[in-house]
C-alpha cells in the first residue's frame, strides 16, 4: 500500500470578530500497524513559520510552546487518533486573519507538513447582534426571565460583560443588569418601550447590542367615556351625563389595554351574558329620550380580565307647553294649561300680566294642578263675567328654560284667540 498524506479541510473560513468558528478537518498519513507506537502529535502553524522553531497556534503536544496570542482560543477538537484535526477558534481577533497549515509527527518516520491544503482564515468586523430570549407574551405583573446571548460566541477568550438598559428596568439593582440573565416584572406602561442588551468582551473594543420593543400584555386598568372628544368624569365606576331630551348623542368608550380589549355597549346594567347594543366602543343615539334614564354600560373584555363603566344619563328637557285654552262653564271661565319638563317645572298663571298666586281669598279665582304621565295639567277658574277684553297667560319654567302661552279673551266673542310665546333662558 502506497504511503499517502492527505488532508481534508476547507480552503477558507470567515468569522466575525469576537465570535467562534469550528473548522472540520481530517487527515491521513502512512502508518504500519507492526511499527512501534510512538505518540502522534499534530500541530497548526501560521503560514510561513518554520515548524522546528516556531510557536504553534494549537497542538496536542504538551512540550511545544503555544503562541500566547492564540493560547486558549485556538484548540484542537476531536480525537487525533481517529485522524480528526478539527480546529476550534474562539474570540476571533482581526490579527488572526491569515493562512494556517497542518503538520503531523509520529516517531522518526512521520514528519509531514500539509502545505498544499492551507486554511485561509478571515476575521471580519462584528455585525452579529445578540439575541434576547424570553417567553412571550410578557404579562403585566408576572415575573419573566430574559436572557441575552450572542449566536456564534463561546467560552473561549476573556469573559463577556453584559449591560441591560430600558425604562422597564428603572427599579432594578444595577448589579442585576450586568448579568446575561435578568428577571423582569413588566408594568402596563412598559408596553412599547425599548429594552437593550449590550455585550462586550473584557479588554477588547468589540461591542454589540440588540434592542427589542416590549410587547406587554395587560388588562384594561381604566375606561374613559368621551362625548364630543371630551372625557367624562368617572366616580366609582359610574359616569354621570346630563343630556337634553331629543338631542342626538355619540359616545366613545376607550380602555387602553394590550392586546386591545373588546369594547361593547349595553342597555342599563347588564348581566355577564347580555346582548350588546354595540359591538364597538361607539354608541350612537339618534335622540335621547326620557326612557334613557336607565343609562348604558360600556364593557371592556380582555383575556386578562374585564372592566365596565355605567353611564348614568340624566335626561333633562325644556318646558313644553300646550295652551292655555279657555271655555265658559257654569262656574265661570275655565282655562287649562298642560306642560311637560324634566325636572318638573313650576307654573304660574297671569291675568293682565298680574300673577295669580294660589286661590284668591275673595274666591274670584281658583287654581288646580294635577299630573298624568309625563304631562302635568293646571286649571284656572275665573268666577264672574268679563268686564272687558282679558289676556290670560300661563308660564312654565325649570332651570333649563321657560315657555309661556297666552289667550286673549274678547268680550262678547265666542272664539278665543290663542298664542304661544316660547322663552328660553
Amino acid at each position: 500500500e502506497k504511503p499517502v498524506y492527505e488532508l481534508q479541510v476547507q480552503k477558507s473560513v470567515t468569522v466575525q470578530e469576537g465570535l467562534c468558528v469550528l473548522v472540520p478537518c481530517s487527515f491521513s498519513y502512512p502508518w504500519r500497524s507492526w511499527y512501534s507506537s510512538p505518540p502522534l502529535y499534530v500541530y497548526w502553524f501560521r503560514d510561513g513559520e518554520i515548524p522546528y522553531y516556531a510557536e504553534v497556534v494549537a497542538t496536542n503536544n504538551p512540550d511545544r510552546r503555544v503562541k500566547p496570542e492564540t493560547q486558549g482560543r485556538f484548540r484542537l477538537l476531536g480525537d487525533v487518533q481517529k485522524k480528526n484535526c478539527s480546529l476550534s477558534i474562539g474570540d476571533a481577533r482581526m490579527e488572526d486573519t491569515g493562512s494556517y497549515f497542518f503538520r503531523v509527527e509520529r516517531g522518526r518516520d512521520v514528519k509531514y507538513s500539509y502545505q498544499q491544503n492551507k486554511l485561509n482564515l478571515e476575521v471580519t468586523a462584528l455585525i452579529e447582534k445578540p439575541d434576547i430570549h424570553f417567553l412571550e407574551p410578557l404579562e403585566s405583573g408576572r415575573p419573566t426571565r430574559l436572557s441575552c446571548s450572542l449566536p456564534g460566541s463561546c467560552e473561549a477568550g476573556p469573559p463577556l460583560t453584559f449591560s441591560w438598559t430600558g425604562n422597564a428596568l428603572s427599579p432594578l439593582d444595577p448589579e442585576t443588569t450586568r448579568s446575561s440573565e435578568l428577571t423582569l416584572t413588566p408594568r402596563p406602561e412598559d408596553h412599547g418601550t425599548n429594552l437593550t442588551c449590550q455585550m462586550k468582551r473584557q479588554g477588547a473594543q468589540v461591542t454589540t447590542e440588540r434592542t427589542v420593543q416590549l410587547n406587554v400584555s395587560y388588562a384594561p386598568q381604566t375606561i374613559t367615556i368621551f362625548r364630543n372628544g371630551i372625557a367624562l368624569e368617572i366616580l366609582q365606576n359610574t359616569s354621570y351625563l346630563p343630556v337634553l331630551e331629543g338631542q342626538a348623542l355619540r359616545l366613545l368608550c376607550d380602555a387602553p389595554s394590550n392586546p386591545p380589549a373588546h369594547l361593547s355597549w349595553f342597555q342599563g346594567s347588564p348581566a355577564l351574558n347580555a346582548t350588546p347594543i354595540s359591538n364597538t366602543g361607539i354608541l350612537e343615539l339618534r335622540r335621547v329620550r326620557s326612557a334613557e334614564e336607565g343609562g348604558f354600560t360600556c364593557r371592556a373584555q380582555h383575556p386578562l380580565g374585564f372592566l365596565q363603566i355605567f353611564l348614568n344619563l340624566s335626561v333633562y328637557s325644556l318646558p313644553q307647553l300646550l295652551g292655555p285654552s279657555c271655555s265658559w262653564e257654569a262656574e265661570g271661565l275655565h282655562c287649562r294649561c298642560s306642560f311637560r319638563a324634566r325636572p318638573a317645572p313650576s307654573l304660574c298663571w297671569r291675568l293682565e300680566e298680574k300673577p295669580l298666586e294660589g286661590n284668591s281669598s275673595q274666591g274670584s279665582f281658583k287654581v288646580n294642578s294635577s299630573s298624568a304621565g309625563p304631562w302635568a295639567n293646571s286649571s284656572l277658574i275665573l268666577h264672574g263675567g268679563l268686564s272687558s277684553d282679558l289676556k290670560v297667560s300661563c308660564k312654565a319654567w325649570n332651570i333649563y328654560g321657560s315657555q309661556s302661552g297666552s289667550v286673549l279673551l274678547l268680550q262678547g266673542r265666542s272664539n278665543l284667540g290663542t298664542g304661544v310665546v316660547p322663552a328660553a333662558l
Epitope: I277, N279, L283, E284, R289, S290, A291, P374
Partner: antibody, heavy 122, light 113 residues
Amino acid sequence: QAYLQQSGPELVKPGASVKVSCKASGYSLTDYNMYWVKQSHGKSLEWIGYIDSYNGGTRYNQKFKGKATLTVDKSSSTAFMHLNSLTSEDSAVYYCAREGFGYDDREWFAYWGQGTLVTVSA
Amino acid sequence: DIQMTQTPSSLAVSVGEKVTLSCKSSQSLLYSTNQMNFLAWYQQKPGQSPKLLIYWASTRESGVPDRFAGSGSGTDFTLTISSVKAEDLAVYYCQQFYSYPFTFGSGTELEIK
C-alpha cells in the same frame, strides 16, 4: 308592554282614498319611529315608510311616494297612513310596526299591529 | 335597493328535526360603526301578523324559544330551528334594515309532515 291597535277593514272604490289608524299603548309614542308595511295576498312584505313621532319627520320607500302619507296625532298616541288614488294593486293588508330600541333610524320591527285589510273594488 | 334571497322557498319537515333556512343579501349588512349585522328574522303564522324572532342577525328577541338561533355575517345568514315543533308551521322572512328602502326576503314556508 307595547301594543298597537289598528283600525278595521276597509272596502273602497277605485280612485278613492282611505286612512288607516294605529293606536299605540304601553309606551310613549314619541319615543319610537312607527313603520308601515304592506302585504299583498299570498305575497311577501314591503316597507312603505316610517314617521318619526317625535318631530313628525317621514321617510318613504320611493315606490310609495305620492301613494302613502304618514301622520301622527301625539295627543291621542295614534299614527295614521293615508292612501290615495286607490287601485286594485293597493288591495292588501297594511301593518303598522314599532321599531325595537329607538336608538337608530334603522331598526327592526319589534311590535306589529294586527293588520288592516284594504280591499279596492268597484 | 338591497335584494334579499331566501332559500328554499318551502320545505316540509317532521317534528323534532333540525331545520336551516338561508338568507343572502346583495351587499354586506355589517355596519362598521357598531360591528352589528342589520338583519332581522320574522315568523308569520297563518292569519297572523309577523312576529320578530331575531334582530342584529343573532340576537334572540325576549320570549322567543331558544330552539331558534340566528347566525351569519356580511351577506350570508341562517336561521336554525334546532328541533321543530308543530307550532313552528309558518312563513319565515328575513329583512335588512341596513339601508333604505328596508327590504324583505320572499319568505320560506315551513310545513310539518
